[in-house]
């Protein structure tokens, strides 16, 4: 029952999604909000935190297949840790291999999400739109 | 409290969204599903109907501002009525002025939705991906 259903099946049940902050998008019990006010990565992160959320974490192509459809570039919660060279999410977990195609657009320690599971490396101080996420599962 | 919040406010309440068919997107109590199997307009319409839904109806830029972010082109439930020259939705309602920018890409009586509230006229028999919608409010 993916977002991109190859075969159409009549759903057996209808269900509620959430809970999410009012007027956020709910998909597979995760909450998403897109903000079109451009902020640097740190201010974007702070904005999400102020709403008990975090910047977008990509953890599953299946559970987050709605992200295939997102146009433009938006800050996500991925940061480069210079001490060990790894890319890490805000929750401290390491980026799983094969989840994102990382593209070095600029020198930087932060990453923009772009459609079809691409991550563009960017300078953290550059203003961009951003995606906040709240996991409820 | 739009999808594109200009000012960040801590939500006073969290709430559930829906009900929707399992694994559909829920936003402002409407349900959306994107299908990447290409079908002509009539088959797309039938697919949505088989799931107690209809092809996408654009009725409010505010309530449907998530559609700003959608990349690519997808069938929506807008058809041209040659007898009176109007564009109407599956439910019989007429397209409200200023909701969509209609662009004549091809000669046709059906329309594709494209990001930022654009509608591209297309031949109804051409296969395309499509968006189903279920209104719960």
């Amino acid at each position: 029952n993916s977002l991109f259903n190859q075969e159409v099946q009549i759903p057996l049940t209808e269900s509620y999604c959430g809970p999410c902050p009012k007027n956020w998008i709910c998909y597979k019990n995760n909450c998403y909000q897109f903000f079109n006010e451009s902020k640097n990565w740190y201010e974007s992160q702070a904005s999400c935190m102020s709403q008990n959320a975090s910047l977008l974490k990509v953890y599953s192509k299946e559970d987050q297949d709605l992200l295939k459809l997102v146009k433009s570039y938006h800050w996500m919660g991925l940061v480069h840790i210079p001490t060990n060279g790894s890319w890490q999410w805000e929750d401290g977990s390491i980026l799983s291999p094969n989840l994102l195609t990382i593209i070095e657009m600029q020198k930087g320690d932060c990453a923009l999400y772009a459609s079809s599971f691409k991550g563009y490396i960017e300078n953290c101080s550059i203003p961009n739109t951003y995606i906040c996420m709240q996991r409820t599962v | 409290n739009s999808l594109f919040n200009q000012e960040v406010q801590i939500p006073l309440t969290e709430s559930y969204c829906g009900p929707c068919p399992k694994n559909w997107i829920c936003y402002k109590n409407n349900c959306y599903q994107f299908f990447n199997e290409s079908k002509n307009w009539y088959e797309s319409q039938a697919s949505c109907m088989s799931q107690n839904a209809s092809l996408l109806k654009v009725y409010s830029k505010e309530d449907q501002d998530l559609l700003k972010l959608v990349k690519s082109y997808h069938w929506m439930g807008l058809v041209h009525i040659p007898t009176n020259g109007s564009w109407q939705w599956e439910d019989g309602s007429i397209l409200s002025p200023n909701l969509l920018t209609i662009i004549e890409m091809q000669k046709g009586d059906c329309a594709l939705y494209a990001s930022s509230f654009k509608g591209y006229i297309e031949n109804c028999s051409i296969p395309n991906t499509y968006i189903c919608m279920q209104r719960t409010v």
Partner: antibody, heavy 121, light 107 residues
Framework: EQSGGGAGGGLVKPGGSLELCCKA?????????MSWVRQSPGKGLEWIGR?????????AYASWVNGRFTLSRDIDQSTGCLQLNSLTAADTAMYYC?????????????WGQGTLVTVSS | DIQMTQSPSSVSASVGDRVTITCRAS??????LVWYQQKPGKAPELLMY???TLQSGVPSRFSGSGSGTDFTLTISSLQPEDFATYYC?????????FGQGTKVEIK
């Protein structure tokens, strides 16, 4: 590194007020949050609240604070303060200013040395 | 508020012993879990974040695991400097909350 554990601690009477301040150094104050955590004698750790070091005014408090405590910050001075009002004996504790690192699971990765606040008549 | 419950509240062990401390959250917190070490008269120090990522400079004898509601801190071979009190903390949502602490004492 964070220097200073909070100036202004000491003995205060019940119902009294006190302001604790903490100056951060050695890192960019504007990209972190300052939090305050307290520890009563022989007890565990209790989170009080957090304030963003950047230009946006984001704060959050523990529900038990109930408006008695207020966080503030001076970005130019890289300083954060905690105003304590309507103090009771139950507020007697060591008060720590801490750096909240939002990229490391919202952990408190640097701690001031702490300021002991004693509420007693 | 999310409650964090640690067990045991204290443990007596000898140098070289393997020590395990558990922390349970009252609701799922994914991997937003942090561990601290506190020695008497000192401020706590960050040990681990993300449930299993060691803070820079922390010895590899410390390890962490878990996700969701159940988490574990393990010291594989206890050293004299490891005798301290250990706290877990959730960073998933405000108010941030700590476990009540586990004191590791010399047997």
């Amino acid at each position: 590194e964070q220097s200073g554990g909070g100036a202004g601690g000491g003995l205060v009477k019940p119902g009294g007020s006190l302001e604790l301040c903490c100056k951060a150094s050695g890192f960019d104050f504007s990209i972190y949050w300052m939090s305050w955590v307290r520890q009563s004698p022989g007890k565990g750790l209790e989170w009080i609240g957090r304030i963003y070091g950047g230009s946006s005014d984001y704060t959050a408090y523990a529900s038990w604070v109930n408006g008695r405590f207020t966080l503030s910050r001076d970005i130019d001075q890289s300083t954060g303060c905690l105003q304590l009002n309507s103090l009771t004996a139950a507020d007697t504790a060591m008060y720590y200013c801490v750096r909240l690192n939002p990229s490391f699971s919202r952990s408190f990765d640097y701690w001031g040395q702490g300021t002991l606040v004693t509420v007693s008549s | 508020d999310i409650q964090m419950t640690q067990s045991p509240s204290s443990v007596s062990a000898s140098v070289g012993d393997r020590v395990t401390i558990t922390c349970r959250a009252s609701q799922g917190i994914f991997s937003w879990l942090v561990w601290y070490q506190q020695k008497p008269g000192k401020a706590p120090e960050l040990l681990m974040y993300g449930a299993s990522t060691l803070q820079s400079g922390v010895p590899s004898r410390f390890s962490g695991s878990g996700s969701g509601t159940d988490f574990t801190l393990t010291i594989s071979s206890l050293q004299p400097e490891d005798f301290a009190t250990y706290y877990c903390q959730q960073g998933y949502s405000t108010p941030y909350t700590f476990g009540q602490g586990t004191k590791v004492e010399i047997k």
